[in-house]
Amino acid sequence: GSERTCCPVNWVEHERSCYWFSRSGKAWADADNYCRLEDAHLVVVTSWEEQKFVQHHIGPVNTWMGLHDQNGPWKWVDGTDYETGFKNWRPEQPDDWYGHGLGGGEDCAHFTDDGRWNDDVCQRPYRWVCETELDKASQEPPLL
């Protein structure tokens, strides 16, 4: 397909990516599915500059990002390497806390009210941010 030169309506362009900020809450998996149906993914934070951009738009509200450890190690949904990548956890996080009484630990990452990250129960209905790269957004997948 022809290269997309701008973001879809209601999305915000920043540094060759498009971002969509929800104003309602969903469980992490449902938020992830919403982004994927928009040919996007939950936001992957790769720099302090991107962190500040997202933080500015979401405000002091718990908001899901595309980072989870539901299958063991922490992973970004787009395959970005976690170990060598940008991190902005709150002190003593992630802690996989079991004391919430909801069963299991905490496997999904979110921005907290100060922007730093925390792991939490994936079923909590938090706001979320979708991201898609402009160049990637322009390409049609091969036909089946």
């Epitope: 929800s22 969903k26 919403y34 049609e140």
Partner: antibody, heavy 121, light 107 residues
Framework: EVQLLESGGGLAQPGGSLRLSCAAS????????MSWVRQAPGKGLEWVSV????????YYADSVKGRFTISRDNSKNTLYLQMNSLRAEDTAVYYC??????????????WGQGTLVTVSS | DIQMTQSPSSVSASVGDRVTITCRAS??????LAWFQQKPGKAPQLLIY???SLQSGVPSRFSGSGSGTDFSLTISSLQPEDFATYYC?????????FGQGTKVEIK
Amino acid sequence: EVQLLESGGGLAQPGGSLRLSCAASGFTFRSYAMSWVRQAPGKGLEWVSVISGRGGNTYYADSVKGRFTISRDNSKNTLYLQMNSLRAEDTAVYYCAKGIAVAGSHYFDYWGQGTLVTVSS
Amino acid sequence: DIQMTQSPSSVSASVGDRVTITCRASQGISNWLAWFQQKPGKAPQLLIYAASSLQSGVPSRFSGSGSGTDFSLTISSLQPEDFATYYCQQANSFPWTFGQGTKVEIK
């Protein structure tokens, strides 16, 4: 004017295959998720599958997973449903439906007229 | 899966009547709910999305309300063209699921 026109329905044997098509017009097809929804005779509506605008992401109801495949050709403004290993319980009118993203969910805002699939020996 | 339960399954009413149909989700779905109207032999038509937003072109006598698990569709003054089957549908999580339908019949 949005138009969705399904085709490809008909009679199939149990275990057989059919391929449904949905020709779309009146909107920028590649920009919207598209779904298939079915309705067995005299019964209610059942969502079958959905595909994202560029085709990279698909989801299925458990009842058809592994047997049905949704796909699209954005150069032809056409949605497809490949139906394999058909069962009697797949007998239904199959509708294609355009999706619209509103505030964090997708809704079916336009529907085709439907095509009848009958699975019988 | 989220089960959607509509009540009543059918209702008899007269032109001009106020009719309310309810829909209950087996778990909370916030306001991620749609209502559809279907006439015999025709495709469904979107009436309400996001629980209470009226789809473009739909008469204002239709209204939706609710959040969480309990929702309703109200027709403020039933018109002859409103006799049909109505379905609710949750759009919160996969698989997307519909209620079993409510048939609005002429009394």
